[in-house]
């Protein structure tokens, strides 16, 4: 997260780490719990590492640092990839995690509402971006993790400013003008929430920008909402009954 | 299965003009960057230009900017390449691209991932 | 622009040997837009490596791309007889986008 700030304890429950274990472990991408056993991720995240056993998932945790070889992870039971997905578009970057055992909720560790299908109307004006990633374009993993505010831009004017992509509308931008404050490498996948009437809503999932933070150049997102068949269809076909966060 | 299928090369004088065109299927046209690439007889490769998903932005290599006109026609699934002003040195092997742009570590990626197989255009007096 | 000067020029191998093929850019280049291309008499150049280092679809384990910044290799750890043709790395972080002159890998 590029001008961002440090969070604190219990502020984004649904967060958590991906990391990968192979000779060494490191954080790769974020992501958000949306169920006792699911995970909500970028598609991108697994490209090139689709065994499911080298991944450990960390929830309820603030500080990377405080992970040592005793820290409880969850293992990947499933990776569901988006069927459109394909490694040479930027399109449908979305990705469901079933972990191998459910997870109880905490006060640091319970899962964000999702938006309802095809939300459009929805008017978001308090919005927020958070993850462990570089806080510059050329930088390092964070330790604590970090938060920004960051306001939704339209796809017509996301457009504009992505003359070479096609913004789709199942992609959400957010950005400033003047850039400064945005996601950046290692936020992949996290969440991008915005609370509207008194309650958190996943909203989109961080997928790519041009570099990070630059002027003029927002920060795009997978729109969850356009994905609510695809989550829903998943995450029940898969266990019969899904016990997923919806609004009410 | 990606297919790119060049054609309208030819025999051409100096200050001549000729229009290759490029036929893609395979893929949803639409939602990608194009681009064509030439190669000189016995030399390398060198970009020529590239045009946007939806058409309205292109950019051309100084050395052909002002006479070479990229386009495409998405309902046709057809890439152009309208050709004036000829020269000598515009002598080559013609290669239309797809630019494919996936996503890495929250970057894009980009890189020329399905070629036609060229089409000659020879200019000549 | 950004200059791409590969070295060498010509490399003379037999099959079963290793190939280090070197691509050197004027300018940083971000490892994202940073290609490898084959290419084989008559034939339209068939993509390698993208991203610097990650192996298109097809093709073998034996080709493997490293490099940051400026400097880049193209390995081919065992050379086999259809691996003999001209290699171009390309870059496409900035426009205008640009090639290496080529390195032939020929029979020794």
């Known amino acids: 997260i590029v001008g961002g700030t440090n969070s604190s304890w219990g502020e984004w429950p649904w967060q958590v780490s991906l990391q990968v274990k192979l000779t060494a472990q490191r954080h790769l991408c974020g992501g958000s719990l949306i169920g006792h056993q699911w995970v909500l991720t970028a598609a991108h995240c697994f490209d090139g590492l689709p065994l499911q056993d080298v991944w450990r998932i960390y929830s309820g945790i603030l500080n990377l640092s405080d992970i040592t070889k005793d820290t409880p992870f969850s293992q990947i039971k499933e990776i569901i990839i988006h069927q459109n997905y394909k490694v040479s578009e930027g399109n449908h970057d979305i990705a469901l995690i079933k972990l191998q055992a459910p997870l109880n909720y905490t006060e640091f560790q319970k899962p964000i509402c999702l938006p309802s299908k095809g939300d459009t109307s929805t008017i978001y004006t308090n919005c927020w971006v958070t993850g462990w990633g570089f806080s510059k374009e050329k930088g390092e993993i964070q330790n604590i993790l970090q938060k920004v505010n960051i306001p939704l831009v339209t796809n017509e004017e996301c457009q504009k400013r992505y003359q070479d992509y096609k913004i789709t509308q199942r992609m959400v931008c957010a950005g400033y003008k003047e850039g400064g404050k945005d996601a950046c490498k290692g936020d992949s996948g996290g969440p991008l929430v915005c609370k509207h009437n008194g309650m958190w809503r996943l909203v989109g999932i961080t997928s790519w920008g041009e570099g990070c933070a630059r002027r003029e150049q927002p920060g795009v997102y997978t729109k969850v909402a356009e994905y609510m068949d695809w989550i829903l269809e998943k995450t029940q076909s898969s266990d019969g009954k899904a016990q997923m966060q919806s609004p009410a | 299965e990606v297919q790119l299928l060049e054609s309208g090369g030819g025999l051409v004088q100096p200050g001549g003009s000729l229009r290759l065109s490029c036929a893609a299927s395979?893929?949803?046209?639409?939602?990608?960057?194009m681009t064509w690439v030439r190669q000189a007889p016995g030399k390398g490769l060198e970009w020529v230009s590239y045009?946007?998903?939806?058409?309205?932005?292109?950019i051309y290599a100084d050395s052909v900017k002002g006479r070479f006109t990229i386009s495409r026609d998405n309902s046709k699934n057809t890439l152009y390449l309208q050709m004036n002003s000829l020269r000598a040195e515009d002598t080559a092997v013609y290669y239309c691209a797809r630019v494919a742009r996936g996503i890495a570590a929250r970057s894009r990626t980009s890189y020329l991932d399905f070629w036609g197989q060229g089409t000659l255009v020879t200019v000549s007096s | 622009d950004i200059q791409m000067t590969q070295s060498p020029g010509t490399l003379s191998l037999s099959p079963g040997e290793r190939a280090t093929l070197s691509c050197r850019t004027s300018?940083?280049?971000?490892?994202?837009?940073l290609a490898w291309y084959q290419q084989t008499p008559g034939q339209a150049p068939r993509l390698l490596i993208y991203g610097a280092s990650s192996r298109a679809t097809g093709i073998p384990d034996r080709f493997s791309g490293t490099g940051y910044g400026t400097d880049f290799t193209l390995t081919i750890s065992r050379l086999e007889p259809e691996d003999y043709g001209t290699y171009y790395c390309?870059?496409?972080?900035?426009?205008?986008?640009?090639f290496g002159q080529g390195t032939r890998v020929e029979i020794k």
């Open positions: 300018q940083f280049v971000n490892s994202n837009y």
């Open positions: 045009i946007s998903p939806s058409g309205g932005h292109t």
């Open positions: 395979g893929f949803t046209f639409s939602h990608y960057l």
């Open positions: 390309q870059q496409s972080s900035r426009t205008p986008w640009t």
